[in-house]
């Protein structure tokens, strides 16, 4: 992989420890928490980033209505188990032996159970809806300009192939970005929509994961876009399995 040779850092992941101990003295970077080697030429998987975060010291124009099966990450942070490729393991458990099943973005998709809980496969999140509310601006945003700028951002900053940005909707002050990526569409080397969405989410919160970059400056024809709130909905290829008790709560 390519880490910055001169000062041996990982441009795409600040939560790494890098040293010139790779083959031929090349710079090699390992994720905090897991110690796994990461490819610094692309985004690091969300699972490894969450693990690193938990190990770090604590310091048409119409909007889309999320499907009834859409998941929102209400559980927040946890220390995940990642497989050897850095993906989330289908079953996650905490220190008190409470277990649950997650999707490919690490969001819980079943009720919590005990160690006997089975999660047969890692269900893929194939559709992500990012719902943003922007701050009032002095100048209005043109929909097509906004669309182009957000597509450019995902292509250039997050290295996500343009075909995976399905749509950008805008009804002031709400912006919705739809990312779609089926298992069959994702080729080797393609950035996962879940990873791109996570990097974007952290950028929007002012917690950039990129090494040495300032905060994300997103402008539409020079007019800065500032985000007041973010909601992210995750849709899985197989609908989640929650009890009726949770659904009516």
């Amino acid at each position: 992989h390519t880490a910055a040779q001169d000062n041996c850092t990982c441009p795409t992941n600040k939560m790494t420890v890098c040293s010139p101990d790779g083959p031929g003295g090349r710079c090699q970077c390992r994720a905090l928490g897991s110690g796994m080697a990461v490819d610094c030429s692309t985004l690091t998987s969300k699972c490894l980033l969450l693990k690193a975060r938990m190990s770090a010291p604590k310091n048409a124009r119409t909007l889309v209505r999320p499907s009834e099966h859409a998941l929102v990450d209400n559980d927040g942070l946890y220390d995940p188990d990642c497989d050897p490729e850095g993906r989330f393991k289908a079953r996650q458990c905490n220190q008190t032996s409470v277990c649950w099943c997650v999707n490919s973005v690490g969001v819980r998709r079943t009720d919590k159970g005990d160690l006997s809980l089975r999660c047969d496969e890692l269900v893929r999140t194939h559709h992500i809806l990012i719902d943003l509310r922007h701050r009032p601006t002095a100048g209005a945003f043109n929909h097509s300009d906004l669309d182009a700028e957000l597509r450019r951002l995902f292509r250039e900053r997050y290295r996500l192939h343009p075909k995976f940005v399905a749509a950008v909707h805008y009804e002031q002050p709400t912006i919705q970005i739809e990312l779609r990526q089926n298992t069959s569409q994702k080729a080797a080397g393609d950035v996962d929509i879940g990873d791109a969405a996570y990097y974007f989410e952290r950028d929007i919160k002012g917690e950039s994961l990129f090494q040495g970059r300032g905060g994300l400056d997103l402008r539409v024809r020079g007019e800065p876009l500032q985000v007041e709130r973010t909601l992210i909905y995750y849709l899985d290829e197989i609908p989640p399995k929650f009890s009726m008790k949770r659904l009516t709560a």
Partner: antibody, heavy 122, light 106 residues
Framework: QVQLVQSGAEVKKPGASVKVSCKAS????????INWVRQRPGQGLEWMGW????????KYNEKFKGRVTMTVDTSTSTVYMELSSLRSEDTAVYYC???????????????WGQGTLVTVSS | EIVLTQSPATLSLSPGERATLSCSAS?????IYWYQRKPGQAPRLLIY???NLASGIPARFSGSGSGTDYTLTISSLEPEDFAVYYC?????????FGQGTKVEIK
């Protein structure tokens, strides 16, 4: 550190034009807009407009539209403000100031250039 | 255009005293920015997004407010704080500044 250095004082006759330059250093020039603000003697601050060097986008105060032109030279990290059809009431100190912003905050006008005194007199 | 009215026009205080400067907008704005200007110098940003201290600005400066009424407070005046203070809005074009409040030594 971030710095804006403006061109020197100018004396112009009514009806003439003036072009003030503002050279930026210490940051990625294309990453923030450059605003122009003037202060007439004994008066407050008056915003004239901004230009965004990355794509050349501009926003002018309607009061100066047709008389003000902002341009950018990315090769030298310099922004220019030209004011035409000068009259005596355009006598003022003209400042350039950069505005940094992220998706989290608008950081205001900071820093400012040292100012350029433009005197319009017959 | 949004008119910002600052009061008082002049504030006469002694070093060590508390200064409270007001900025009233003709229509609701989301955020206000405060600048300090000394004779012969360029303005300097003090507060951005209503209440955030700009880089290098001492903690004795603070900002607050919402809607149409905003305040800049200097908790204990230092000799170098005697200057003219301006508020500014970024809510709609044209961007506008208040006419300024002069803080002078009593």
């Amino acid at each position: 550190q971030v710095q804006l250095v403006q061109s020197g004082a100018e004396v112009k006759k009514p009806g003439a034009s003036v072009k003030v330059s503002c050279k930026a250093s210490g940051y990625t020039f294309t990453s923030s807009d450059i605003n122009w603000v003037r202060q007439r003697p004994g008066q407050g601050l008056e915003w004239m407009g901004w230009i965004y060097p990355r794509d050349g986008s501009k926003k002018y105060n309607e009061k100066f539209k047709g008389r003000v032109t902002m341009t950018v030279d990315t090769s030298t990290s310099t922004v220019y403000m030209e004011l035409s059809s000068l009259r005596s009431e355009d006598t003022a100190v003209y400042y350039c100031a950069t505005r940094f912003a992220t998706v989290v905050s608008n950081y205001g006008l900071d820093p400012w250039g040292q100012g350029t005194l433009v005197t319009v007199s017959s | 255009e949004i008119v910002l009215t600052q009061s008082p026009a002049t504030l006469s205080l002694s070093p060590g005293e508390r200064a409270t400067l007001s900025c009233s907008a003709s229509s609701s704005v989301n955020y206000i920015y405060w600048y300090q200007r000394k004779p012969g110098q360029a303005p300097r940003l003090l507060i951005y997004d209503t209440s955030n201290l700009a880089s290098g600005i001492p903690a004795r400066f603070s900002g607050s407010g919402s809607g149409t009424d905003y305040t800049l407070t200097i908790s204990s005046l230092e000799p170098e704080d005697f200057a003219v203070y301006y508020c500014q809005q970024w809510n709609s074009y044209p961007l506008t500044f208040g006419q300024g409040t002069k803080v002078e030594i009593k």
